[in-house]
């Protein structure tokens, strides 16, 4: 789903404040809910019908370092019998999402939201179209 | 998929560097990839043989402000005949994403990272149990 | 975290009737299953019905199947068990819970769970 444009004022100081120094805000370090863990159904990607295989990128600089991407296995789903089923799609599920970008010039660091695309996993569906057209 | 702690180094400065003042950190202004936006196939909640709805939540003080959570529709998948096939489970997905929570006292105002859960879709999976156990 | 409040349980005759409430709050915005559990004395807990949400289809357990219809009020986060031709071996303590992976749900998943209501079918 779609994050906003921060262009808005969530990240301003109420108009009758004085405004931000040099372009920065302050950060309190520690993350709420940071023991909030995903716990899903064992082995979703390879018993669904629209399967996918997960990789993982890593970026030292990035939080989280270590960002997992699903890539569908299939253009088609997986019928009962294992077979594809090349009359639906496999699709992916993508998600926008956050993570903070870490960057220093000796002492002196900051850090900076970035958003980043993840698709998440896969599902199947009935064709809009069989073709290109 | 899983955001590591954050109780690591990835906050703090090295350790040659004097340490950063009141627990909290510079957090530039303004998001790399703004523009980047989630272009997924037209529908997929409703053509999905793992059907979903979304619902949308919203906090002023959250940055995004929506955050939309999916909902599986059915507890098994809708078979070509548009028919439930209870043989078959719909499953959620769900993603570990961050968000940005403002917190203000007048004009002094700090932001915090926060993680949440979000149900991105659903997927049908061939089931491990027929029925709780 | 949920709060399950049971209610509505009661000493019946064999082949009588009986409905039991659930109220729900607390639930995560994407929750998407509730169910209906029970637990004789001396025995596992085990599975009855489940009941989605958004599409309002229901499971159930062979041994109550016909017998019992599961229900939900969306609005009111309150679900429903109806349960007809009671026998003797229905007794038990039923519980309601969140079924956050709908019918792959484990038991081991439950962090916690309500006080329950007790049912007693007398022959």
């Known amino acids: 789903r779609k994050i906003p444009k921060v262009g808005h004022t969530f990240f301003q100081k109420p108009e009758s404040c004085p405004p931000v120094p040099g372009g920065s805000m302050k950060l309190d370090i520690g993350i709420i809910n940071e023991n909030q863990r995903v716990s899903m159904s064992r082995n979703i990607e390879s018993r669904s019908t629209s399967p996918w295989n997960y990789t993982v990128t890593w970026d030292p600089n990035r939080y989280p370092s270590e960002v997992v991407q699903a890539q569908c296995r299939n253009l088609g789903c997986i019928n009962a019998q294992g077979k594809e089923d090349i009359s639906m799609n496999s699709v992916p599920i993508q998600q926008e999402t956050l993570v903070v970008r870490r960057k220093h010039q000796g002492c002196s660091v900051s850090f900076q939201l970035e958003k980043v695309l993840v698709t998440v996993g896969c599902t199947c569906v009935t064709p809009v179209i069989h073709h290109v057209q | 998929r899983k955001i590591p702690k954050v109780g690591h180094t990835f906050f703090q400065k090295p350790e040659s560097c004097p340490p950063v003042p009141g627990g909290s950190m510079k957090l530039d202004i303004g998001i790399i990839n703004e523009n980047q936006r989630v272009s997924m196939s037209r529908n997929i909640e409703s053509r999905s043989t793992s059907p979903w709805n979304y619902t949308v939540t919203w906090d002023p003080n959250r940055y995004p402000s929506e955050v939309v959570q999916a909902q599986c529709r059915n507890l098994g998948c809708i078979n070509a005949q548009g028919k439930e096939d209870i043989s078959m489970n719909s499953v959620p997905i769900q993603q570990e994403t961050l968000v940005v929570r403002r917190k203000h006292q007048g004009c002094s105002v700090s932001f915090q990272l926060e993680k949440v859960l979000v149900t991105v879709g659903c997927t049908c999976v061939t089931p491990v149990i027929h029925h709780v156990q | 975290q949920v709060q399950l409040v049971e209610s509505g349980g009661d000493l019946v005759q064999a082949g009588g009737s009986l409905r039991l409430s659930c109220s729900v709050s607390?639930?995560?915005?994407?929750?998407?299953?509730m169910g209906w559990f029970r637990q004789a004395p001396g025995k596992e807990r085990e599975f009855v019905a489940a009941?989605?949400?958004?599409?309002?289809?229901?499971r159930y357990a062979d041994s109550v199947k016909g017998r019992f219809t599961m229900s939900r009020d969306n609005a009111k986060k309150q679900v429903y068990l109806e349960m007809n031709s009671l026998k003797p071996e229905d007794t038990a303590v039923y519980y309601c819970?969140?079924?956050?992976?709908?019918?792959?749900?484990?038991?081991?998943?439950?962090?916690?769970w309500g006080q329950g209501t007790q049912v007693t079918v007398s022959s």
């Open positions: 009941i989605s949400w958004v599409g309002g289809d229901t």
């Open positions: 819970n969140d079924m956050p992976y709908g019918m792959e749900t484990r038991m081991d998943d439950y962090a916690s």
């Open positions: 607390g639930l995560r915005v994407s929750s998407y299953a």
